[in-house]
């Protein structure tokens, strides 16, 4: 019987540790996409509606803030699209990029952790264009560090929650 109790307690301990594991999945706020044709920071994301969720991490001022030291898997998916009903592209040669950036407040510094994208020729003869970028990687993050997303040509972002999102989840502690 003691073994049973111990086993249940271990399960409970494991489960509560898992539940405390930080994670975030943030989806683009389509009502507040910035304008610009060069690299801009995306600061408006949902964290509590639709597919978006956050636990033991903080979302503030457009940045995902780490609350616990650890090794995290970071990911971002950015979709760009253009349909002729919205008008014409002023230029057919485009650089469509995403940058995942880490900012440290304690030692003021900023580093690009991941980038992805391509140059594209979106011909005016086509009715619809689409391009998707997915980046992901494993990083050591410290409490207080902030993760942010920058993109080129934000006016071409696909505003759907299944198209433009980013997130993180803790995989293990720092030994």
């Amino acid at each position: 019987e003691k073994a049973m109790v111990d086993g249940s307690w271990l399960d409970l301990a494991k489960r509560s540790k898992l539940e405390a594991q930080p994670f975030a999945h943030l989806t683009i706020n389509a009502t507040d996409i910035p304008s610009g044709s060069h690299k801009v920071s995306l600061s408006s994301w949902y964290h509590d509606r639709g597919w978006a969720k956050i636990s033991n991490m903080t979302f503030s001022n457009g940045k995902l803030i780490v609350n616990q030291d650890g090794f995290y898997y970071l990911y971002a998916n950015i979709c760009f699209r253009h349909h002729e009903t919205s008008g014409d592209l002023a230029t057919e040669y485009l650089q469509l990029m995403v940058y995942v950036t880490k900012t440290s407040i304690k030692i003021p510094s900023s580093h690009t952790l991941m980038k992805g994208g391509s140059t594209k020729y979106w011909s005016g003869n086509s009715e619809f264009h689409f391009y998707s970028i997915n980046v992901g990687g494993f990083f050591k993050l410290r409490s207080g560090e902030e993760i942010s997303i920058e993109v080129s040509n934000p006016s071409l972002l696909d505003p759907d929650q299944d198209a433009t999102y980013f997130g993180a989840f803790k995989v293990r502690d720092i030994d």
Partner: antibody
Amino acid sequence: QVQLVQSGAEVRKPGASVKVSCKASGYDFSNYAIHWVRQAPGQRLEWMGWINAGNGNTKFSQKFQGRITVTRDTAASTAYMELRSLRSEDTAVYYCARDQSNMVRGIIIAYYFDYWGQGTLVTVSS
Amino acid sequence: EIVMTQSPSSLSASVGDRVTITCRASQSISRYLNWYQLKPGKAPRLLIYGASSLQSGVPSRFSGSGSGAEFTLTISSLQPEDIATYYCQHTRAFGQGTKVEIK
């Protein structure tokens, strides 16, 4: 304030060419596109083409392809539309219009014509 | 190619009347629809863009609504200076116009 001032009325014979100018003032000319739209007597407005004043990129209606040239002089903040091989059905009032989309803020030419020139009457008659 | 169809082609109303003009697109155009006012010998004027956004400087008696393929321009209280021809427009396509006159 934003103003588009067009050149004066023109009379041409069939087969000739005409070049209409559109001088912009009151805004940064290079940051916007200029469209050309015409209206023949008793007809609806008809879009002809646009020029991105910043990079000189152009797009034209299939109907005018091969007959139309649109250029710009950024130093003079002026756009030009030349129509060749004129026929009597080209008799119309020709307008230039600014696209509302600022090219610094995005790269979509949205076809919202927020400011227009006063129009230039081109008469094609033998 | 998208075709824009306006109705009616002309209308006559009294000062103070509520006037409604309809514009239909041959396929869905979301909310990418603009309205212009044209008076003889004057530069056209943008009234409404994006189906319902009032252009700066345009009197609030003008309003726009609709999405998809059906749109309306409403003048809540017709004024003598509103005598003009009104055009709807989606990108490269214009409606045939609606001439508004005073009774």
